[in-house]
């Protein structure tokens, strides 16, 4: 009488998460009487996957009808495979008894599960930085298997080279995670720029996953200030304008100072946007020259995005002709008690 053999023909089987796996097993003899069981892993800690004798295993079915005695095929289907199902599966024949006695095990079939990486999530710095500074972006993707994966960084379509990538864990696992940090040097033109993290994996069939981040969230372009005056039609009035150029983001507070004293404060509104994504804004004062005859310094002070204020000063120029137009009744001290009229545009 030939000795019973348990044959598992495949050394390994690979399936994609969500699909079904078929694990094949045949026996060369039905003698002695006793159940066939499937286990994941070997040794005392092995996990029972299917017992053809009894039990409720909702994800496992036999390939052929187990009630046909002359059927020596004990192959099983496992449905809805997840990465947690990875491992080596053993088909084991027992002799009926109390307890059942293990007679022979198959050589085992290693089930590897191909699992897609999650959509890459790109996160930028917590604080904004100014042009010429370097900022870091992090890209994370999880739950993929096998471990081999390729990650690339792009800025506006151009591949970046300054990045560091780690795949965890280092050892064998049911699934893996990748984390990569790229260093990007900001320029003044980066308000409209975008960084892209691209992940390629065997499960994606050549169609990589991408995660993006906008540099607009990471950059602060400080404004440049210019203050100038222009005469008005009324001979005793001049327009003093503060031109705030090329700033990002929009948040801006402007204060006019008259010889160091706060004259008025306003928040930027009605901005004009430049092609590069930065903004311009201008604020102006209508100054009565008769109230300000000599030595008045007007200062435009700008606080941008919560940063320390920058300022630009302008000494008010009053011509001899304008002075002549002022009657004695309108002349007064250098710091006129009445605040000058202001405006913005």
């Amino acid at each position: 009488e030939e000795e019973l053999q348990v044959i598992q023909p495949e050394k390994s089987v690979s399936v994609t998460a969500g699909e079904s796996a078929t694990l094949n097993c045949t026996v060369t003899s039905l003698i002695p009487v006793g159940p066939i069981q499937w286990f994941r892993g070997a040794g005392p800690g092995r996990e029972l996957i299917y017992n053809l004798k009894e039990g409720h295993f909702p994800r496992v079915t036999t390939v052929l009808d187990p009630t046909k005695r002359n059927n020596m095929d004990f192959s099983i289907h496992i449905s809805n495979i997840t990465p947690a199902d990875a491992g080596t599966y053993y088909c084991v024949k027992f002799r009926k008894g109390s307890p059942d006695v293990e007679l022979k095990s198959g050589a085992g079939t290693e089930l590897s599960v191909r699992a897609k990486p999650s959509a890459p999530v790109v996160s930028g710095p917590t604080a904004r930085a100014t042009p010429e500074h370097t900022v870091s972006f992090t890209c994370e993707s999880h739950g993929f298997s096998p471990r081999d994966i390729t990650l690339k960084w792009f800025k506006n379509g151009n591949e970046l080279s300054d990045f560091q990538t780690n795949v965890d864990p280092a050892g064998k696992s049911v699934s893996y995670s990748i984390r990569s940090t790229a260093r990007v040097v900001l320029t003044r033109r980066d308000v409209h720029s975008q960084v892209i993290c691209e992940v390629a994996h065997v499960t994606l069939q050549g169609d990589p996953l991408r995660g993006t981040a906008n540099l607009s969230e990471a950059i602060r372009v400080p404004p440049t200030l210019e203050v100038f005056q222009r005469p008005m039609r009324a001979e005793n009035q001049v327009n003093v304008t503060c031109q705030v150029r090329k700033f990002y983001p929009q948040r801006l507070l402007l204060t006019w100072l008259e010889n160091g004293n706060v004259s008025q404060t306003e928040t930027a509104s009605t901005l004009t946007e430049n092609k590069d994504g930065t903004y311009n804004w201008r604020s102006w004062l209508l100054v009565n020259t008769c109230a300000h005859r000599d030595g008045v310094v007007l200062t435009c002070q700008v606080e941008h995005d919560g940063q320390p204020a920058v300022s630009k000063s302008h000494a008010l120029e009053v011509s001899a002709h304008q002075k002549e137009q002022c009657s004695d009744t309108t002349s007064g001290p250098v710091l006129a008690p009445t605040a000058p009229l202001g405006g913005s545009g």
Partner: antibody, heavy 118, light 107 residues
């Protein structure tokens, strides 16, 4: 349809012999462990004998040496040769198929009556 | 030989009742226990194998449990056709042995 049909029962004197037959249909008898179970009038069930797929045979103590179980694959039939019959062997004899993994009984014949009496 | 003891030997119940029959083995039989139903003048019918698995076509009102030496058969809601004699059987080792039977009668 899977079916077992017994025959060969009847009245026999003590010390006499009888051969019971069980014809199987709807399955291959040689692929299963097969059994004989009996039930004396008004009594419970008693397992009598079995034959395994390899031809190995088993008997309950009271019939050992007197009864012989066998099968004929060509006829898909099971037999029980009963010799030296006693009054205590009087019973309905059932042919039973053992189940797939563990030999649990699944299919029963309708039974044949054996009466041992003088 | 392994002795099988059923209790009670007889039981009176009404239609709709839930009844439980117990079976005890004289030694550990793992879960190699079967239950059979027999009506007068008929061959036994296989109900349950490996203590809790229902044979094909057996209604789910029948359920079995237990392992080792103590086992139960439960019929959840008795119907007229369920009044019969029930037997347990061990089949872990030869000679296979049956319990003495439990006669379930209508009250």
């Amino acid at each position: 349809e899977v079916q077992l049909v017994e025959s060969g029962g009847g009245l026999v004197q003590p010390g006499g012999s009888l051969r019971l037959s069980c014809a199987a249909s709807g399955f291959t008898l040689s692929s299963y462990d097969m059994h004989w179970v009996r039930q004396a009038p008004g009594k419970g069930l008693e397992w009598v004998s079995a034959i395994g797929t390899a031809g190995d045979t088993y008997y309950t103590g009271s019939v050992k040496g007197r009864f012989t179980i066998s099968r004929e694959n060509a006829k898909n039939s099971l037999y029980l040769q009963m010799n030296s019959l006693r009054a205590s062997d009087t019973a309905v004899y059932y042919c039973v198929r053992g189940g797939v993994w563990d030999d649990a009984f699944d299919i029963w014949g309708q039974g044949t009556m054996v009466t041992v009496s003088s | 030989d392994i002795q099988m003891t059923q209790s009670p030997s007889s039981l009176s119940a009404s239609v709709g009742d839930r009844v439980t029959i117990t079976c005890r083995a004289s030694q550990d039989i793992n879960n190699y226990l079967a239950w059979f139903q027999q009506k007068p003048g008929k061959a036994p019918k296989s109900l349950i194998y490996t203590a809790s698995s229902l044979h094909s076509g057996v209604p789910s009102k029948f359920s079995g449990s237990g392992s080792g030496t103590d086992f139960t058969l439960t019929i959840s809601s008795l119907q007229p056709e369920d009044f019969a004699t029930y037997y347990c059987q061990q089949y872990v080792s030869y000679p296979y042995t049956f319990g003495q039977g439990t006669k379930l009668e209508i009250k």
